[in-house]
């Protein structure tokens, strides 16, 4: 048993049929010595008396809010949550496996630049009685500070009968230098509590590996005289690290016809303009990637050819 | 030692070209190592991230773009600060810092070159003959060092008397390649920045 926060405790249980469970001793936080009784949740049934209560925790029915009273007055509470371990593996029932970039990916994180700010998100099918708390640090043995906000529900997605909820959190490394060479990874820890079930999820990464720039901005076309060619120009996204001559991007320009079957023309360039042939009903798209460290491409910015 | 002249002249451009070749070569070599040594801990997640230049050179700090010198987090480990007379930079100071930057890059390359050559000598003794260092990568390191044009004492190749542990050598190769790739990214950024200014 360990304390998650004040008056909230997590009991770690090996979860298999007829498991013996864990013996837990609760102590009433009071100077009083006699006349103390214990109840669980909303029930008025007295579970025991005295300053301490010894219980055998085996299943979710044994978890919940234990309250000690004296003469009708509440003295203190202890909330017991369960953390299940099945076949030596901690349960991951609350969050959905996103399977990207690999199986058992519950948390995904992205950064728009090298400022030390990043966003993590996760999915669940659970809609109520759910709380998350997020902690993060740079390195684990001698951790350096990363500050995370509160996790918020950002989206609901419905696919037929299935509803999933997306939560996200923003974190900022306390003293980040965009030019630094990372040698210790960022660690992100998410505590998830659904009703009386506790689970924790972790992710470890270097900012350089989770970079995904915003799409290029101000995508414009300029037709070239007496030609089917156009000059496409764009700018670095506002959110990208500066100076741009140090934090350079490379770009992919794509011309795509209306039908998916039509051949796509692709050009790669380090410049912020390119000359392409604009076909009728086609669209021109541009995306960006760090020029020197191949992390993710941005989403596409697109304009119609016409 | 000859300090390079700090005027962004056409002489900077070959360095940019060589640094791009360097990044390409080390990235290819790392990819090859990850594929060939697939049953060894050779991915970014599996290895310890060591920097053989730590406490010996200060490339990131010495080559910091001017725009980032206002960032306290970038300055806290610097012995030499760009900032003089408030936020004004004297041109002599700028050229001195650029010389410091380029000489630091040169020292990095020299250190990695020695390590890689020593390692290759060990790998050539491996009866499995599983992996060797790409000669192109070693040549590119050499070309960039020549383009940087420093006169420096030659560091003798480390020789080891004991029997090499090939498993450890291959893991060390992965660690070195990961670290060198990160440093090659920094060098490329620096050359691009200097070329633009």
């Amino acid at each position: 048993i360990w304390e998650l926060k004040k008056d909230v405790y997590v009991v770690e249980l090996d979860w298999y049929p007829d498991a013996p469970g864990e013996m837990v001793v609760l102590t009433c936080d009071t100077p009083e010595e006699d006349g103390i009784t214990w109840t669980l949740d909303q029930s008025s049934e007295v579970l025991g008396s005295g300053k301490t209560l010894t219980i055998q925790v085996k299943e979710f029915g044994d978890a919940g809010q234990y309250t000690c009273h004296k003469g009708g007055e509440v003295l203190s509470h202890s909330l017991l949550l369960l953390h299940k371990k099945e076949d030596g593996i901690w349960s991951t029932d609350i969050l959905k496996d996103q399977k990207e970039p690999k199986n058992k990916t519950f948390l995904r994180c992205e950064a728009k630049n090298y400022s030390g700010r990043f966003t993590c998100w996760w999915l669940t099918t659970i809609s109520t009685d759910l709380t998350f708390s997020v902690k993060s640090s740079r390195g684990s043995s001698d951790p350096q500070g990363v500050t995370c906000g509160a996790a918020t529900l950002s989206a609901e997605r419905v696919r037929g009968d299935n509803k999933e909820y997306e939560y996200s959190v923003e974190c900022q490394e306390d003293s980040a230098c965009p030019a630094a060479e990372e040698s210790l990874p960022i660690e992100v820890m998410v505590d998830a509590v659904h009703k009386l079930k506790y689970e924790n999820y972790t992710s470890s990464f270097f900012i350089r590996d989770i970079i995904k720039p915003d799409p290029p901005k101000n995508l414009q076309l300029k037709p070239l005289k007496n030609s089917r060619q156009v000059e496409v120009s764009w700018e670095y996204p506002d959110t990208w690290s500066t100076p741009h001559s140090y934090f350079s991007l490379t770009f992919c320009v794509q011309v795509q016809g209306k039908s998916k079957r039509e051949k796509k023309d692709r050009v790669f360039t380090d410049k912020t303009s390119a000359t392409v042939i604009c076909r009728k009903n086609a669209s021109i798209s541009v995306r960006a990637q760090d020029r020197y460290y191949s992390s993710s491409w941005s989403e596409w910015a697109s304009v119609p050819c016409s | 030692r000859n300090l390079p002249v700090a005027t962004p002249d056409p002489g900077m451009f070959p360095c940019l070209h060589h640094s791009q070749n360097l990044l390409r070569a080390v990235s290819n070599m790392l990819q090859k190592a990850r594929q060939t040594l697939e049953f060894y801990p050779c991915t970014s997640e599996e290895i310890d991230h060591e920097d053989i230049t730590k406490d010996k050179t200060s490339t990131v700090e010495a080559c910091l773009p001017l725009e980032l010198t206002k960032n306290e987090s970038c300055l806290n480990s610097r012995e030499t600060s760009f900032i003089t007379n408030g936020s004004c930079l004297a041109s002599r100071k700028t050229s001195f810092m650029m010389a410091l930057c380029l000489s630091s890059i040169y020292e990095d390359l020299k250190m990695y070159q020695v390590e890689f050559k020593t390692m290759n000598a060990k790998l050539l003794m491996d009866p499995k003959r599983q992996i060797f260092l790409d000669q192109n990568m070693l040549a590119v390191i050499d070309e960039l060092m020549q383009a940087l044009n420093f006169n420096s004492e030659t560091v003798p190749q480390k020789s080891s008397l004991e029997e090499p542990d090939f498993y450890k050598t291959k893991i060390k190769l992965c660690i070195l390649l990961h670290a060198f790739r990160i440093r090659a990214v920094t060098i490329d950024r620096v050359m691009s920045y200097l070329n633009a200014s």
């Epitope: 950002s154 997306e166 795509q256 669209s283 798209s285 596409w300 697109s302 | -």
Partner: nanobody, 117 residues
């Protein structure tokens, strides 16, 4: 091309809530991304929230924790639940969709949201 129709705009007091809805029609299979942008008088159109068929929802910092985007992949609808509204949320809200990652955006005609006491 996709046709988009918004509904649910109106006048609301500061601190109040509104729900905007948008339905897509036309020759569509699965739409890659749907979402909402807004344009306040004299300002540029800005992102509010967009949600792709997979990957991360993009929510503007200014509305994080107050607005929730909901998307139904079968009905091809998107909704925006706006809570704790502020006067600075006053704008014309536009529904937005892209059939594929590289296709050009389609826009609805817009719906006015006014937050005022």
């Amino acid at each position: 091309q996709v046709q988009l129709v918004e509904s649910g705009g109106g006048l609301v007091q500061p601190g109040g809530s509104l729900r905007l809805s948008c339905a897509a029609s036309g020759s569509i299979a699965e739409i890659y991304v749907m979402g909402w942008y807004r344009q306040a008088p004299g300002k540029q159109r800005e992102i509010v929230a967009t949600t792709p068929s997979s990957g991360r929802t993009n929510i503007a910092d200014s509305v994080k924790g107050r607005f929730i985007i909901s998307r139904d992949f079968v009905k091809n609808t998107v909704a925006l639940q706006m809570n704790s509204l502020k006067p600075e949320d006053t704008a014309v809200y536009y529904c937005y969709a892209r059939l594929t990652p590289t296709s050009v955006a389609s826009w609805g005609p817009g719906t006015q949201v006014t937050v005022s006491s």
